[in-house]
Every structure is written in C-alpha cells, then in structure tokens.
Interface confidence: medium
C-alpha cells in the first residue's frame, strides 16, 4: 500500500508548511530570526537549527539585516551596500531608529507613578512600563529620554542609570526574550535587580506588574508595526494586550461566561466554550461567574483557587496531566517535561541537558503510555490545557535557541510555571 | 570513541545458568539505558530487556521474564545478564545494545555479541 | 505486543537500482520506527530513527518515510556494500520488537 505524505503537514505558530518547506521563525521580540532555519519533517515535526557562520577574511565584515551571517564589502550587492536601519510608524507618527517617545493608553493597569515609555528600533516598537522615581520638586521638567518627569538638575538620570535599559540596548538579551506566561508571583528574590526574570514575559490574562517596583523597572510588550499596528484590542472601552482573555460584556445580557475573547494583534477572536456533555456525578451545579456547570463536592472546595471540574476541565478546556523529572549526575542536568494526552493515546516529553548553564541538548519524543510508566523519576506536577502546552512550546523554542550560546539558570523553571493554571484571575476564567 | 566489549563464547548444558558481561566505555555509561538482544541461528532479532545503570531499574520483555536476570556494576560501568534453566531453545546470539538517549529508544551502538550454546 | 510485518523477505538487486522495503505496524506507532542493517557476521547497525531521520555517518542515498502503521527505507542507488540483512523496530512501546528481517543481495 502506498504510504500518503499529502495529509502530513507542520503547524508551528498557528501556520501550516508542507513537509520540506523551509522558513526562518518569527520570535517575538526578534521579529524574524534569521540565524534560525526551520524545516518542516515528514513525519510532521518541525526541526529548527542555528545557523553556523562561516569565518570571513575580511577586517571590517557587514551586518545586513535579513541575512544572518556577516559577509565581506566586497561580496554584497552593489545596490545594498547602504545599510539603513527602518523607521517605526505608531499611531500615524513617524518615529526613526533608537528615538524615544510616549504612549498612551497600553497597559490598563497602569500605577498612578508609572508612565508608558516606547522605543523604535529597527522598525518594531517596544514598549514598557517605567516606575517614576518619587518626586521632591514642585515643579518637574519634561527630559527628551524618557517619559518620566524630572526635578530641575535631575536630568543626568537617564535610562543608562535604570535598571535593566533594554531600550539603549535592544541586543540585551536578558531583556528582550519574551512569551506569555500565567499570572503567578515569583519569590522575591527574584525580583531583587529589580527586573523579574523574564521582562518580556506579558500574562495571557493580564500584564505582570509588581507595584512596589524600584525605579525604572520594565515590563515590556512588543508591538510590531510592520506586521501589527499597535498590538492592542479595544472591547467595550477596555484596553487588551496580546494574547490577554476576557469574556464580553454585552449590554444586553452582562458578562457572557460561556463565550471567551482573546485578543489576537488587535483583532478580538472570540469563541463560544464547550462544557462537557457527560459529568462524572449526578447532579453538576451551575455556579456563578463559570460557564459549565461543576459537580459539587469534596474536591472543589479542597481547591479554592482553581477553575477545574472534576472531569479535568479548565474554563471549559480539557487539561491534561504534566509530569516532571530531574536528573542530576557529573555535573549535567537532564530535565524532562511530558505532557500525557488521550488523542492520540500517548506522552510527549521534552527532554533539556543543561552543563555549566549552557543548554548541551534538547528534544522531543513521543512514547506511549506503558512505555511511560515504565520510566523511573516521574513526578505529576500539575494539569495543564493544550493553549498552554502550546504556550509553553513556543516559549521553549525561544529559550532553547538562547541557552545553547549562553547561561541560563532558571529560564526552563520559569517557564514551567506558565503549565500551572491553578491562580486564575480573581477565580474566574 | 563509545565502545561496547561483550564476553566471550559460552557452552553450557542444559538446566545450568550462565552470566555474560557487557563492558561500556567512551561515554557517560550512567545516562543511557542498556538494552539485550537476543538473535536465534539466522533468525530476527528479539528484545530481552534493558536496564537503567544509574539505579539498576529494570524492565523485562514478558517473555524473558524470569529466564534473564540483567544487573549492573557501576564502577566497572559493566552489565551483566543472566540466564537460566537454559534449554536449545536458548542457544543464540545475544547482544547488548546502547540506548541512543534520553528516551531515545532507538540502539545506536552494539556490542560484538555473545554466542551462547546450550548443548548436552 | 506490536507485531511488525516486513517484506519482503529477500531481494536481489543490480548497482545503482533503488530498492524499497516496508514494514506494517499491528498499530500506530506515531513515527517510532527504526531501521537496522546487519552483515554477515557482525552486529546491527543503526541507519534510520525517528522514521525518517538518518544516524550519523549513514550514506544520504538511504532513507525512510511512513506515517502511522506503513513505512518504508529506500536506498537511491545500490551499492556493493548494502549486501546485508535489514530489519525495523518499532520504539513505541514496550516490548520492543523487531521485523522478521529482508535479505538483500547483489545481483
């Protein structure tokens, strides 16, 4: 019988490519990566490897900005010798390379001492939170390098003094790896330069901001003009960033629980929530502010901020089990993440080998179930939906092509914790 | 270079228990699973077992249950397998085989191979 | 247990001819297919995981491919030192299990 290879396709980043095609993935801050080369495998996997650069024999080799590796003057094309960088159009105004400028109205939980500082670099714009310095002064003076006002004389504070300036320097790369994350507080310590672990990281359900922040500390979205025009989406006089979920609010009939919004660049996806037709008790209980009714019991109350039904649903989402495993010998830790899911019958886990920090090797396998239990050192550590997997995956992608070239300590930690889904917002979804 | 040097020939008579070694060398002999191969005269090849080095967990092939027994020696970085109550049926190749990784379960290097006669 | 169909058992072929042997899963193994090559007299050798994927070291003119239950290895252009035995595992699930093995010689 002859074997099909028509229906075998890669979804990466919600697209499709064919088995074979080749793209550079596009990775938010970055925008498009182009010393990452992405195949589509036959058997439907996506496999992305680095660009290796050759040696150039040249004294002063030129960066161009759609290829990857530098090249030598004197093998460019005449016409793109001129390497300029793009300007960034925000809101109708044109604003050139490295220049600073204000924006109203992006994060809706904005503190009364933060101000909304945005940055055009190589045609994106970034975008963060800065926390004011407190003010001594009656009357503070405007400063061209930031959107925070100054005492008289205070003016030698700019970005070069604040903490973490991913703006000055967008090649920061502490700063400047971003993916979305569940809202969850991380330990203090962490927080200690100031900059949590993961600037860039923006919750789906809402920005992670830490009030008592010190001065001049970032929490960055990204907005992409070329591809996104100010990747925000206005719902009922309501400002969402990317990737935030809210329900809508109808006038007609209030908060509609059983549809579910996000917002995808600026445009609002909204679709209706499934619940499920067979409930493993009698008599499920609709509960208000939840869409699908909960079988009463033990349980629920035994997990008072979780949105789960005994069935293993998540604001209507089925969840699935996540199991972790770490191994630690001769200096190397293996890290293994597995997700177990019912369609198809199987566990796939993503294994890191991480030395010294450095990322030594990282894969994907699929094994069945049986083959699964059969494994030593497994733990279930939480239960997580596919929206999140998915999540999850993106933003290992990302960091797995980081930590292979630099230290990294905690950035797969941290990353786990976007699978907990146990701190919905407020108790809702 | 990884390298896995197997014990020599064996001839044994039937009912007695035999012990074959498989040395590891050239890689971190801790991180990978070890699997048994048996292979009968001119037949398919038929997975025994395969043990884990860095605690000694084993998992068997239903079939071998109780005929092979596999252990490990740590600081020889060393498996051993054993078989009993050997009949004919018993008289095969029998080849230990590196797991490829971490949950790679795909055998990407080999030993020479252990030929086994069980002859009265 | 996952039993594997091979075929075909033996086969004769000229240098330079592409040759296809397939294996049929009892089940879906989700791509976890091995190949294996083996000469007379020594040990198996790995040559395709994953399916599809090829080992270190192992000549670009072999190749695998398949989805769920059917696969195949093809070798582009024969080669005197192809003279060998060669079987598939599936590495899905436990026990694993190998095919019955395709001989393939020169003609």
């Known amino acids: 019988e002859q074997v099909k290879h028509s229906e075998t396709y890669c979804m990466f980043q919600d697209k499709k490519y064919r088995v074979g095609e080749r793209w550079h993935p596009y990775l938010e801050p970055y925008g498009l990566v182009y010393c990452v080369n992405c195949i589509c495998s036959e058997n439907g996997n996506v496999l992305c490897s680095r660009v290796r650069c050759p040696n150039v024999h040249c004294l002063s080799p030129v960066h161009i900005p759609h290829l990857c590796c530098p090249r030598c003057p004197d093998s460019l094309p005449p016409v793109n010798n001129k390497v300029t960088s793009k300007s960034c159009e925000y809101n109708g105004t044109t604003y050139q390379h490295g220049e600073l400028f204000v924006a109203e109205g992006l994060f809706q939980n904005r503190q009364p001492n933060q101000c909304t500082q945005c940055s055009c670099s190589e045609g994106n714009v970034y975008c963060g939170l800065k926390t004011c310095p407190k003010l001594t002064c009656a009357f503070p003076v405007s400063v061209p390098d930031s959107c925070c006002r100054v005492c008289r004389g205070d003016g030698e504070l700019s970005w070069e003094h604040s903490d973490g300036d991913i703006f000055r320097q967008p090649a920061n790369r502490e700063a400047r790896h971003s993916y979305h994350r569940s809202h969850y507080d991380p330990p203090p310590s962490r927080q200690a330069g100031g900059l949590s672990r993961f600037p860039g990281a923006r919750s789906h359900r809402g920005a992670l901001m830490d009030s008592q922040q010190a001065s001049g500390t970032i929490v960055q979205i990204v907005i992409n003009n070329k591809h996104k025009h100010g990747q925000v989406c206005v719902s009922n006089g309501k400002t969402y960033s990317h990737g935030e979920s809210w329900h809508p609010n109808l006038r007609a009939f209030g908060i509609v629980e059983c549809v579910l919004c996000t917002c995808n660049v600026t445009k609002q996806e909204c679709k209706k929530i499934h619940c499920p037709n067979r409930y493993p008790c009698k008599y499920p209980q609709k509960i208000d502010g939840k869409c699908c009714k909960v079988c009463p019991g033990k349980k629920a109350k035994e997990l008072p901020g979780q949105s789960f039904d005994n069935k293993g649903y998540f604001c209507g989402e089925e969840t699935m089990p996540v199991y972790e495993s770490v191994f630690m010998e001769d200096g190397e830790t293996t890290r293994k993440i597995a997700l177990e899911t019912e369609r198809p019958p199987q566990v796939e886990v993503h294994v890191w080998t991480i030395r010294k920090g450095i990322l030594q090797h990282f894969h994907i396998e699929k094994i069945s179930k049986r083959m699964f239990e059969e494994l030593p050192h497994f733990k279930l550590v939480t239960r997580t939906t596919l929206s999140q997997w998915k999540i999850f995956t993106e933003g290992e992608a990302q960091i797995s092509q980081m930590c292979s070239s630099r230290v990294c300590r905690t950035e797969l930690e941290d990353l786990v914790k976007v699978l907990y889904l146990e701190r919905s917002e407020k108790g809702h979804c | 270079e990884v390298q896995l040097q197997q014990s020599g020939p064996e001839l044994v008579k039937p009912g007695d228990s035999v012990k074959i070694s498989c040395k590891a060398s050239?890689?971190?002999?801790?991180?990978?699973?070890m699997n048994w191969v048996m292979q009968s005269h001119g037949k398919s090849l038929e997975w025994i077992g395969r043990?884990?080095?860095?605690?000694?967990?084993?998992f068997y092939n239903q079939k071998f249950k109780g005929k092979a027994t596999l252990t490990v020696d740590k600081s020889s970085s060393t498996v051993h397998m054993e078989l009993r109550s050997l009949t004919s049926e018993d008289s095969a190749v029998y080849y230990c085989?590196?797991?490829?990784?971490?949950?790679?379960?795909?055998?990407?290097?080999w030993g020479q191979g252990t030929t086994l006669t069980v002859s009265s | 247990d996952i039993q594997m169909t091979q075929s075909p058992a033996s086969l004769a072929a000229s240098v330079g001819e592409t040759v296809t042997i397939t294996c049929r899963t009892s089940?879906?193994?989700?791509?976890?297919l091995a190949w294996y090559q083996q000469k007379q007299g020594k040990s198996p050798q790995l040559l395709i995981y994953?399916?599809?994927s090829l080992e270190d070291g192992v000549p670009s003119r072999f190749s695998g491919s398949g989805s769920g239950t059917q696969y195949s290895m093809k070798i582009n252009s024969m080669q005197p030192e192809d003279t060998a035995t060669y079987f598939c595992?599936?590495?899905?699930?436990?026990?694993?299990?190998f095919g019955s093995g395709t001989k393939l010689e020169i003609k």
């Open positions: 595992k599936q590495a899905y699930d436990v026990p694993f299990t």
């Open positions: 043990i884990n080095p860095y605690n000694g967990d084993t």
């Open positions: 994953n399916a599809n």
């Open positions: 085989a590196k797991g490829a990784g971490a949950l790679r379960n795909y055998f990407d290097h």
């Open positions: 089940e879906n193994i989700y791509y976890s």
């Open positions: 050239g890689y971190s002999f801790t991180g990978y699973f």
